[in-house]
Interface confidence: medium
């Protein structure tokens, strides 16, 4: 199926930028792995590079505004021609759910005191209003709550006195049109506007003041332009050469608004001064290699020794990584393929242990399933032997850091009937549904 092809993928927002054009296949668009595509306008943007997980979205708002609730966040597998870690197809969302609490307590309503006395009338003639007030303290609200209804009420009051009405101008009427629209006519163009003393008219009894100033004004029409000439397009110029050596590019034709040139404020030519076409080199673009994550450290050993486990004897271990995805003469991965370090082996060593403090509460699991819970743990943590933290392996090569490696067998006193891990679980509350932000319903 044809797609919309773009020249850039914006990692931070997940949006396609720089529309190259539509009506091309995914395969042609993705000859250049820097490009991106959409299956339909406004749809999900997928980059042409090999798939990987996007950054996690920000946490959604807490599902309740007070007491304990839950909130979700997601990330999306984005890319083309492959899968993300976990053997997941591009377009898939992965979710995380955690507990949240915007405000510990929930608001409680208060109650009103009795009404206070009426204040004096707001005017000294004609009709006005008077007000009385009450306090929200019977009882006072709690935790940001309020009292239902209004803290004050008003009613009409009549002074039994007639007020005078002073005259005021209504707004100016519009300027009358100038007698000519271009300069150079026989008469000097003028424009006039008027207004009425009607907003309001002055009263007769008791007498109000008349409106101050004049009821009309006149002015000369200034800045009238010479009569305008509309612009017209010249012919299209030659098509520019294809600007790329691989993948899809964009060629351009141009024309000039000079047939004739617009004059005296006449309108510029309607339409575009340039038009573009997609050009296809049919050549795949180079793809640089990217390092996979480091592999596991190999066992900690010392040459010519059967085992150095549980002994103050430094050994060596290594780990490797693979340069993946390099195609069509792209750059090789920079840096080392192998990493070597010095180590003490504590693999399967019986070590004295101590119980850790409680860990922080973990994420709610499952994030998109029924009855999610969160957990925290106390672990039996091994006390590491006090071996030298650095060693000098070869004369004159300086000190090297030595790292403990391996899974020891820590021994702690029993805690709640457990020897290695004590776990506490809690249900997550007010859990929202996992909804795809791109496509709620397709």
């Amino acid at each position: 199926d044809p797609v919309l092809c773009f020249t850039q993928y914006e990692e931070s927002s997940g949006k396609c930028k720089g529309l190259l054009g539509g009506g091309v296949s995914v395969e042609d668009c993705c000859l250049n792995t820097a490009f991106a595509y959409q299956k339909r306008s406004g749809g999900l943007c997928q980059p042409c590079r090999s798939p990987r997980w996007s950054l996690w979205s920000t946490w959604a708002p807490c599902s309740v505004t007070c007491s304990e609730g839950s909130q979700l966040r997601y990330r999306r597998c984005v890319g083309w021609n492959g899968q993300c870690s976990g053997k997941v197809a591009p377009g898939t969302l992965e979710w995380q759910l955690q507990a949240c609490e915007d405000q510990q307590c929930c608001p409680e309503m208060g109650g009103w005191s009795g009404w206070g006395p009426w204040e004096p009338c707001s005017v000294t003639c004609s009709k006005g209003t008077r007000t009385r007030r009450r306090a929200c303290n019977h009882p006072a609200p709690k935790c940001g709550g309020h009292c239902p209804g209004q803290a004050q009420e008003s009613e009409a009051c009549d002074t039994q006195q007639v007020c005078p009405t002073h005259g005021a101008w209504a707004t100016w009427g519009p300027w009358t049109p100038c007698s000519a629209s271009c300069h150079g006519g026989p008469h000097e163009p003028k424009e006039t506007r008027s207004r009425k003393c009607s907003a309001p008219e002055p009263s007769q009894k008791p007498p109000g003041k008349p409106c101050p100033g004049l009821a009309y004004e006149q002015r000369r029409c200034t800045g009238l332009p010479p009569c305008p000439v509309a612009g017209g397009w010249g012919p299209w110029g030659p098509v520019s050469p294809c600007p790329v050596t691989c993948g899809l590019g964009q060629t351009m034709e141009q024309r000039t608004c000079n047939h004739p040139v617009p004059q005296h404020g006449g309108p510029f030519c309607a339409g575009d001064a340039t038009r573009t076409h997609i050009c296809n080199t049919a050549v795949p673009c180079p793809v640089d290699g990217e390092w996979d994550s480091w592999g596991e450290w190999s066992p900690c050993i010392r040459r010519n020794m059967k085992s150095i486990s549980c002994q103050e004897i430094p050994g060596q271990q290594s780990r490797g990584r693979t340069c993946r995805g390099r195609k069509f003469d792209g750059h090789r991965c920079a840096g080392q393929q192998q990493d070597i370090r010095h180590c003490y082996s504590i693999q399967h060593c019986p070590l004295k242990g101590s119980w850790s403090e409680w860990s922080t509460w973990g994420l709610c699991m499952p994030p998109c399933g029924p009855n999610p819970t969160r957990a925290r743990q106390r672990l039996c943590t091994p006390l590491l032997p006090k071996y030298p933290p650095t060693v000098s392996m070869v004369e004159g090569q300086g000190e090297k850091n030595v790292t403990f490696w391996g899974r020891p067998l820590p021994r702690c006193e029993e805690l709640q009937g457990q020897k290695l891990v004590v776990e506490e679980k809690r249900p997550c509350l007010h859990v929202p549904a996992c909804k795809d932000p791109e496509e709620e319903e397709l």
């Epitope: 197809a89 029924p370 549904a433 795809d436 709620e440 319903e441």
Partner: nanobody, 129 residues
């Protein structure tokens, strides 16, 4: 082990309606996402519709959107596919599928057969004048 049993297929005239049912047993139905797929003779299996465990998200293939509706009842451990305005090109064996990931979602996830862990035996739907 989860068992899925489809029913409700049959012969119907163009423009007619059918309601397929998929009854499940042997698992916690409320924690599964459920999907319907179909396979016509000599063609590849294709996605029809899917619903998440709460039924809060529903997804449809373009070819059936507006004509077919997927629904579920967690108390009855059953998912349905209501098919209206049927066309001859809807003729196929219809399969029900269940998926128990509670971590992933999205239209592209539920349209792939590899996503689902359990499948029914299928029910034949024939649309013919």
């Amino acid at each position: 082990q989860v068992q899925l049993v489809e029913s409700g297929g049959g012969l119907v005239q163009p423009g007619g309606s059918l309601r397929l049912s998929c009854a499940t047993s042997g698992g916690t139905f409320s924690s599964y996402a459920m999907g319907w797929f179909r396979q016509a003779p000599g063609k590849e299996r294709e996605f029809v519709a899917a619903t998440t465990w709460q039924g809060s998200n529903r997804y449809y293939a373009e070819s059936v959107a507006g004509r077919f509706t997927i629904s579920r009842d967690n108390a009855k451990s059953t998912v349905w596919l209501q098919m209206n305005s049927l066309k001859p090109e809807d003729t196929a064996v219809y399969y029900c599928a269940a998926e128990h990931s509670t971590r992933y979602s999205g239209f592209y996830y539920y349209t792939r057969g590899e996503t689902y862990h359990y499948w029914g035996q299928g029910t034949q739907v024939t649309v013919s004048g």
